[in-house]
Interface confidence: low
């Protein structure tokens, strides 16, 4: 999908590649002379649709699901974005310039132009992984962003990952060949669901309150420096380091991949002709040309690879999973032919793995990656990809072993460091995770500049009491990952009003608030009755958000679905809520009772999305000792009164009373979301 910077991809002639086909030829000359228009990209298939956003029909009933406490860490304490397999395709001109030097690796450009209608995308996929989420799972996605001219409210990722894990030669098609992989480390299962930062434009952008200086923060009380809290050492001048430095790496010229074996060199003209068709976007003709070459020369690896690429292209054009499965099969066929050049073998299997992930076939992708590592045991980037493969199926132990092996050989590999740090943090080895996450981000290596790593590093630092956490949040904000230092949700719609605390009038949901406050005793009594009769319906928080204490919840609605079993325990409350679709229809939120016992502290944490606001109705509130901080303002609950806050801002809870605290949590759509957005935004 990317708008390719050909100068970087193709070396010196790249600047003359005016028609965007990857070479300098007559067409380019025409463009440069003003005789022909520059080419533009066709919309490509938004790959995040590879996993259906809507919940699968056969999903476990809500009452059987692990409950998502405050539901924040659920998607968020975890999900990380990384550029998976960079540049799987090959320049068409590789055939013409087989032994020439290659240019600098392409910088991925992550503004993608595309239509985002859900219905037009690939038909329903069959992911091999569960759609449920608990705490630390890994997700895969391909990054796309919204075509702003379309009134589409699909969630789009704008995570910025310009680089990639292995700079091999790029195909110039406007593909996002490097599926961004979002990881949510789950304890037990992997989830394949895109992480997104919705590219939805709302005309009026209201700056968050932290745009204005706050003279006194309740949270940050030490030296007010925008720079690190600890003393610094000067960074020594650059020495002759090897290629751990990404800038140095870029300077090391990679050899042009050799894609033709001896036989293929004899049919080079025919291969070139077919490849030219593919490059020109004449996909159906190219498919036929390569099919004919495969028929004529069944032992030709390059012809087979060309056929696979064409099928890959066709799958996108037709938005067909069936065609894509064929491409995946053909990439495999390439690898099984005799006398396949090593470079071609690697490209073919990497692309196969990538496309398998696109379809949600994580285990199949893992097998492909394992084979790649066996074939190319000295390629660190493949080992890094293998680590991701394990994370995607929830096998953190094997992933950890892979990254330990990488770091034992290349101790300065930033990609391995951030992932290793991530795994340590998922295992609750908070302090141990910090240096790996920090050094990994600081390395600047491809795949390390990602919001989730900043999120985890900051979170780990907060948990060990290191105020430098805010430096990393600030840096994450400045690098485009967070809306602000305080607002660090990752599933966002751009331009929504951002403030930590809201009044009922500001939300527009005054009727709902009135109804909750008028009926608070009814709501309270039903909650207390469930506590007395069916304690098992209150499930403990299981997302590692507590420093200490006891905190449970009883969920009535989740992801816009009513939990019928739970509503039997609180029938009047459920009936009351049915009148308010802004909450019952809020597929990015929940409605639930929340009980917190004395001696509980909930770590500072951030919700997953800016698309909802959270109402807290006080039901049983001890006289003192219970408080909630959102951003830099701390408040207390009152029985029968509603507090409203935006949980995409950092918040923290203390329960130091002498008896339990019971509140009723009601999530509502952010009031600035349009009806269409509310209908089309995928559930969280």
């Amino acid at each position: 999908f990317d708008l390719v910077d050909y100068e970087e991809v193709l070396g010196k002639l790249g600047i003359y590649d005016a028609d965007g086909d990857g070479d300098f030829d007559v067409d380019d000359a025409k463009v440069l002379l003003g005789l022909k228009e520059r080419s533009t990209s066709e919309p490509a298939v938004p790959p995040e649709e590879a996993e259906p956003h809507t919940e699968p029909e056969e999903q476990v009933p809500v009452e059987a699901e692990p409950q998502n406490i405050e539901d924040e860490a659920k998607e968020q304490i975890q999900s990380l974005l990384h550029e998976m397999v960079h540049a799987e395709h090959v320049e068409g001109e590789d055939l013409q310039q087989e032994d020439g030097p290659t240019g600098e690796p392409q910088q991925e450009d992550d503004e993608f132009l595309m239509a985002t209608d859900v219905d037009d995308r690939f038909e329903t996929l069959e992911p091999e992984v569960s759609h449920e989420e608990t705490e630390h799972s890994y997700h895969v996605e391909e990054t796309v962003s919204q075509d702003c001219n379309q009134d589409m409210e699909e969630m789009m990722s704008e995570q910025e990952n310009p680089d990639s894990s292995e700079p091999v030669v790029e195909d110039e098609r406007l593909h996002h060949d490097t599926d961004d992989v979002t990881y949510q480390v789950y304890e037990e299962q992997a989830v394949y669901e895109p992480l997104e930062n919705e590219g939805i434009e709302i005309t009026e952008v209201t700056a968050p309150p932290e745009d204005n200086p706050v003279e006194d923060s309740q949270v940050i009380v030490e030296e007010v420096s925008i720079f690190p809290v600890e003393e610094q050492q000067e960074v020594p001048p650059e020495t002759n380091r090897k290629t751990d430095d990404p800038e140095q790496k870029a300077k090391v010229k990679k050899k042009k991949p050799k894609l033709l074996n001896k036989f293929d060199k004899t049919i080079k003209a025919e291969l070139d002709a077919a490849e030219k068709l593919r490059k020109r976007g004449k996909i159906e003709e190219a498919v036929n040309a390569f099919k004919e070459l495969v028929r004529k020369y069944p032992q030709s690896p390059r012809a087979r690879y060309g056929k696979a690429q064409c099928e890959d292209d066709l799958a996108e054009k037709r938005r067909s999973n069936e065609v894509l499965r064929g491409a995946i099969e053909t990439y495999q066929e390439v690898a099984s032919l005799p006398d396949v050049p090593a470079d071609l073998l690697k490209l073919s299997l990497k692309r196969r793995s990538d496309r398998q992930q696109f379809l949600g076939h994580m285990r199949g992708s893992l097998l492909t990656l394992q084979r790649l590592v066996q074939l190319f045991p000295n390629d660190t980037s493949l080992k890094n990809d293998l680590g991701v493969g394990y994370l995607l199926i929830g096998d953190n132990d094997n992933a950890k072993k892979v990254y330990e092996e990488v770091l034992s050989v290349t101790p300065n590999d930033g990609f391995a460091k951030v992932h290793y740090g991530f795994i340590l943090k998922a295992q609750n080895k908070i302090a141990e995770s910090i240096p790996y996450l920090k050094e990994g981000i600081e390395s600047g290596d491809p795949g390390t500049d990602d919001g989730r790593f900043y999120f985890h590093l900051g979170d780990a630092m907060q948990r060990v009491g290191n105020k430098e956490a805010y430096k990393w949040y600030e840096l994450g904000h400045k690098r485009g990952h967070f809306a602000s230092v305080w607002q660090r949700s990752l599933y966002n719609v751009n331009g929504l009003k951002a403030q930590p605390w809201w009044t009922p009038k500001e939300t527009g949901y005054t009727e709902l608030v009135k109804s909750l406050e008028r009926n608070w005793k009814l709501i309270r009594d039903e909650g207390l009755a469930v506590m007395d009769k069916a304690k098992g319906l209150f499930l403990p928080e299981d997302e590692n958000l507590r420093e200490k204490g006891d905190w449970s919840q009883f969920t009535l609605w989740q992801q816009g679905r009513r939990n019928e079993n739970a509503c039997k325990g609180a029938p009047k409350t459920c009936t009351l809520l049915e009148k308010f679709p802004e909450t019952t229809g809020c597929r990015r939120g929940q409605i639930k009772y929340s009980i917190m016992h004395p001696g509980t502290h909930v770590w500072p944490h951030t919700g997953p999305t800016n698309c909802r606001l959270r109402m807290h109705l006080g039901l049983v509130i001890p006289k003192e000792g219970c408080k909630i901080r959102c951003a830099n303002e701390t408040r207390t609950w009152e029985e029968g009164k509603v507090l409203i806050f935006d949980d995409s801002f950092e918040h923290e809870v203390w329960q130091d009373a002498s008896s339990f605290r019971l509140i009723f949590i009601v999530d509502v759509w952010h009031p600035e979301l349009t009806p269409q957005q509310r209908r089309s935004l995928p559930a969280i």
Epitope: E8, Q107, D110, E160, V205, V224, I226, F227, K471, K478
Partner: antibody, heavy 125, light 115 residues
């Protein structure tokens, strides 16, 4: 009203030294990082130093490291820039500025939101 | 390496709308930048901070005629109903912290002439 007033510029010979200062008023000086920025005769702006609010941390581009020293006296609300081993390419107008705020408040902490009038430095024999 | 690219000059008729571009290098395309205005014989003045999503916060005393927007690696400063006092050099800047070291880079500036 935020005010930044530079002083101490002048004509210096190559290899010489110079220390100039910036007096701040109208805001809580000790809460802000403070940078120096210079503007070459060709009107190009170049950041040359930043010091953190408490003075513990100093930052320089490689082009001036070792020759320029930024410091501050929060009691006097004053920022300083010491220049040594001056070269002709150091000829410029030097501005002090205020750079953002601290964690958790303004997210404008990289922005140089107020600037002084500048003090001119000419390095010539 | 952090790099900002600006065209060197632009001319606009009085009362027209102007749109200036500052382009980040691809690797840093998500970064938040700042715009500054420098009128003849005056120090630079902070105009706004501009994020990748186009949201922006303007500095003190900046008229409503100034707005910002973003597209990809491009950051735009728009001036509607341009006035003689808007004749100035407009400079973009961006900061980052790399391996514990702070850096701040300015673009070359665009000289705006009001005809």
């Amino acid at each position: 009203e935020v005010q930044l007033v530079e002083s101490g510029g002048g004509l210096v010979k190559p290899g010489g030294s110079l220390k100039f200062s910036c007096a701040a008023s109208g805001f809580t000086f000790s809460r802000y990082a403070m940078p120096w920025v210079r503007q070459t005769p060709e009107k190009r702006l170049e950041w040359v130093a930043t010091i953190s609010s408490g003075g513990s941390y100093t930052y320089y581009p490689d082009s001036v490291k070792g020759r320029l020293t930024i410091s501050r006296d929060n009691a006097k609300n004053t920022l300083y820039l010491q220049m040594s081993s001056l070269r002709s390419e150091d000829t410029a107008m030097y501005y002090c500025a205020r750079q953002g705020n601290y964690y958790g408040s303004s997210h404008l902490y990289y922005a140089m939101d107020y600037w002084g009038q500048g003090t001119s430095v000419t390095v010539s024999s | 390496q952090l790099v900002l690219t600006q065209s060197s000059s632009a001319s606009f008729s009085l009362g027209a709308s102007a749109k200036l571009t500052c382009t980040l290098n691809s690797q840093h395309r998500a970064y938040t930048i700042e715009w500054y205005q420098q009128q003849p014989l005056k120090p630079p003045k902070y105009v706004m901070e501009l994020k990748k999503d186009g949201s922006h916060s303007t500095g003190d005393g900046i008229p409503d005629r100034f707005s910002g927007s973003s597209s990809g690696a491009d950051r735009y400063l728009s001036i509607s109903n341009i006035q003689p006092e808007d004749e100035a050099i407009y400079i973009c800047g961006v900061g980052d912290t790399i391996k514990e070291q702070f850096v701040y880079v300015f673009g070359g500036g665009t000289k705006v002439t009001v005809l």
